[in-house]
Interface confidence: low
């Protein structure tokens, strides 16, 4: 079975900068999985943000500003990355990655 690890326990960002979060997949080939990213803002329910499927298809939650989040999968490092552009106060949250094995 696949295993997920998010190396950065916490991240402090300067406003307007770009944050890149990592999710390392082990125990299974990342190219044969779909990776989902979620965020949980303080006091709010967890929310789906974006996913990248085994075939590279990216799906984003409607209502999220275009270009705000970019998701990718890097086979060389078996890592999925979530890039958050133009970091602002509304982006303060806990971000989770999840795995769907095909």
């Amino acid at each position: 079975a696949g295993h997920l690890e998010q190396p950065q326990i916490s991240s402090t960002k300067t406003l307007s900068k770009t944050a890149r979060l990592e999710c390392v997949v082990s125990g299974i080939t990342i190219s044969a999985t779909s990776v989902y990213w979620y965020r949980e803002r303080p006091g709010e329910v967890i929310q789906f943000l974006v996913s990248i499927s085994y075939d590279g298809t990216v799906r984003k939650e409607s209502g999220i500003p275009s270009g705000k989040f970019e998701v990718d999968r890097i086979p060389e490092t078996s890592t999925s990355t979530l890039t958050i552009h133009n970091v602002e106060k509304q982006d303060i949250a806990t971000y989770y990655c999840a795995l769907w094995e095909v």
């Epitope: 190396p7 950065q8 991240s11 900068k17 890149r20 270009g67 970019e70 990718d72 890039t83 552009h85």
Partner: antibody, heavy 125, light 109 residues
Framework: EVQLVESGGGLVKPGGSLRLSCAGS????????MNWVRQAPGKGLEWVSS????????YYADSVKGRFTISRDNAKNSLSLQMNSLRAEDTAVFYC??????????????????WGQGTMVTVSS | EIVMTQSPGTLSLSPGERATLSCRAS???????LAWYQQKPGQAPRLLIY???SRATGIPDRFSGSGSGTDFTLTISRLEAEDFAVYYC??????????FGQGTKVEIK
Amino acid sequence: EVQLVESGGGLVKPGGSLRLSCAGSGFTFRSYDMNWVRQAPGKGLEWVSSISTSSGYIYYADSVKGRFTISRDNAKNSLSLQMNSLRAEDTAVFYCARDRGIAVAGDYYYGMDVWGQGTMVTVSS
Amino acid sequence: EIVMTQSPGTLSLSPGERATLSCRASQSVSSSYLAWYQQKPGQAPRLLIYGASSRATGIPDRFSGSGSGTDFTLTISRLEAEDFAVYYCQQYGSSPPYTFGQGTKVEIK
């Protein structure tokens, strides 16, 4: 081998246009922000433009804003710079450079870690 | 716009000597967002230091970076023949995203 190769430079008259290309190989091109940096003869480095991984964020130096357009094709691992209304002061070697962006853990800038060999653009009548 | 000013313009030293290059920002820059590059004649620049003090892959430990706020330093502890080149500092910001210093040439005395 991780590599960037620029092409498209040459001699052009003032007011003319030129399109530069940069081909990436040996790495997952779509995962990196990309930049164009230029260097006039005998001068220092000048950042020209940058583009984010999915082209959602694009920036230009004031000196080229409105005249240059950066774009990328992740399916072809290529970066382009369309240069219009060229001026004599645009004469320079143009480099494309890979940008590793901002690291989250530790919060630091990784820098431009891979550069092409450069392509010369000469604007003269 | 943040202006990066490097000094001296030229540094004349002998192999084996210590080189100290300065980079000053017109306003405070996070040390996290400061990089140094080396460029030799006819070649593309090469990343040396990122995050003000972290050496890039393959860079020898005679190169070190330090500083914070507006003042940053690149030190080459013992100059070797291949170290004679031009060095640039660069800051990452948001308007514009990048600014380079004008460069410091390290030449053989």
